[in-house]
Interface confidence: low
């Protein structure tokens, strides 16, 4: 499998550009947005027919260190009675976001990018009822 | 968030912060080959809360393609298929990680960028406000 | 001067208990969020446990999760880390740092930590 590389564009490359050594890429990781706050609905994660949990992991040799990922509390989905309704399925929703990557040898430090999945809540579905023939 | 300090035993740098710029390895390690949400699951369709996946494409970003998700309904699907108005389809939102070109147009230098995505969208019971 | 001693490593047998303590001079540790990291010989750093004191959060690597635990005395400008029902895979140096985000990486010079019967 291939992996994908970032630095491939179409864009013809300007003068300005600075320079950087092969196989490698400059990353400036001050955050741009860094202070967005997410503004969901109040505890949906509760309030949801298909609620989920959040556990947060921490890696301090990623960065963010800091990833919450969400878990579907039950298998079916909750019915207007309150009551776990296994007719319907609660599913994860996942969404890639990227990482950086921290890895030492000796005294140097080197830094490699990471695509993760996050999941990031659940929903209710109708379930795929396969027939047996 | 939390950092890694350097080995002790390794020489001080001049300054005590972290590098802002990084120079890091152009192969991305990616497990995860299937950005397409319309071709990973359909989920978007079988949902109580059903949603519309949008592309929104920039080149100067990467990923360069990102789906948006918008809730078709305000309320919810019912089991006999009708929009059920007492419940309400919400997005799920997520602040992701890519990488903005900087400076515009350059192949091979890129900074962080935080950005909000919806993702999905769930069926959840309104909160009611009583007017007194 | 920053200063970081780290005290209270030793030789223990497997489902025994220790506390390390960290004694932190030349800054508040109510300013910083200070954590312990741990290093076995060949292995990659591990970060073990922070205390964030400005959000009042704390933070386990999963292979301590349970077992571990981080305390503050800002009185006494001291980290501990009680660590209970150890493992011959907790052997390692143990080291106190500051675990900022991408900031101030002071580090103390490590205690070692061994388990074995």
């Known amino acids: 499998r291939k992996i994908p590389k970032v630095g491939h564009t179409f864009f013809q490359k300007p003068e300005s550009c600075p320079p950087v050594p092969g196989g490698s890429m400059k990353l400036d990781i001050g955050i741009i947005n860094e202070n967005q706050r997410v503004s969901m609905s109040r505890n949906i994660e509760s309030r949801s027919t298909s609620p989920w949990n959040y556990t947060v992991t921490w890696d301090p040799n990623r960065y963010p260190s800091e990833v919450v990922q969400a878990q579907c509390r039950n298998l079916g989905c909750i019915n207007a009675q309150g009551k776990e309704d296994i007719s319907m399925n609660s599913v994860p929703i996942q969404q890639e976001t990227l990482v950086v990557r921290r890895k030492h040898q000796g005294c140097s430090v080197s830094f490699q990018l990471e695509k993760v999945l996050v999941t990031v809540g659940c929903t209710c579905v109708t379930p795929v009822i396969h027939h047996v023939q | 968030g939390i950092t890694i300090p350097r080995n002790p035993g390794c020489p001080n740098s001049e300054d005590k912060n972290f590098p802002r710029t990084v120079m890091v390895n152009l192969n991305i390690h990616n497990r995860n080959t299937n950005t397409n949400p319309k071709r990973s699951s359909d989920y978007y369709n079988r949902s109580t809360s059903p949603w519309n996946l949008h592309r929104n494409e920039d080149p100067e970003r990467y990923p360069s393609v990102i789906w948006e998700a918008k809730c078709r309904h305000l309320g919810c699907i019912n089991a006999d298929g009708n929009v059920d108005y007492h419940m309400n389809s919400v997005p799920i939102q997520q602040e992701i990680l890519v990488l903005r070109r900087e400076p515009p147009h350059c192949p091979n230098s890129f900074r962080l960028e935080k950005i909000l995505v919806s993702v999905g969208c769930t069926c959840v019971t309104p909160i009611v406000h009583h007017v007194a | 001067e920053v200063q970081l001693v780290e005290s209270g490593g030793g030789l223990v047998q497997p489902g025994g208990s220790l506390r390390l303590s960290c004694a932190a001079s030349?800054?508040?540790?109510?300013?910083?969020?200070i954590g312990w990291f741990r290093q076995a010989p060949g292995k990659e750093r591990e970060g073990v446990s922070c205390?964030?004191?400005?959000?009042?959060?704390?933070y386990y690597g999963d292979s301590v999760k349970g077992r571990f635990t981080i305390s503050t005395d800002s009185a006494k400008n001291t980290v501990y880390l009680q660590m209970n029902s150890l493992k011959p895979e907790d052997t390692a140096v143990y080291y106190c740092a500051t675990c900022t985000d991408f900031e101030y990486d002071y580090w103390g010079q490590g205690t070692q930590v061994t388990v074995s019967s």
């Open positions: 205390d964030s004191s400005s959000d009042g959060r704390t």
């Open positions: 030349g800054f508040a540790l109510g300013y910083y969020a």
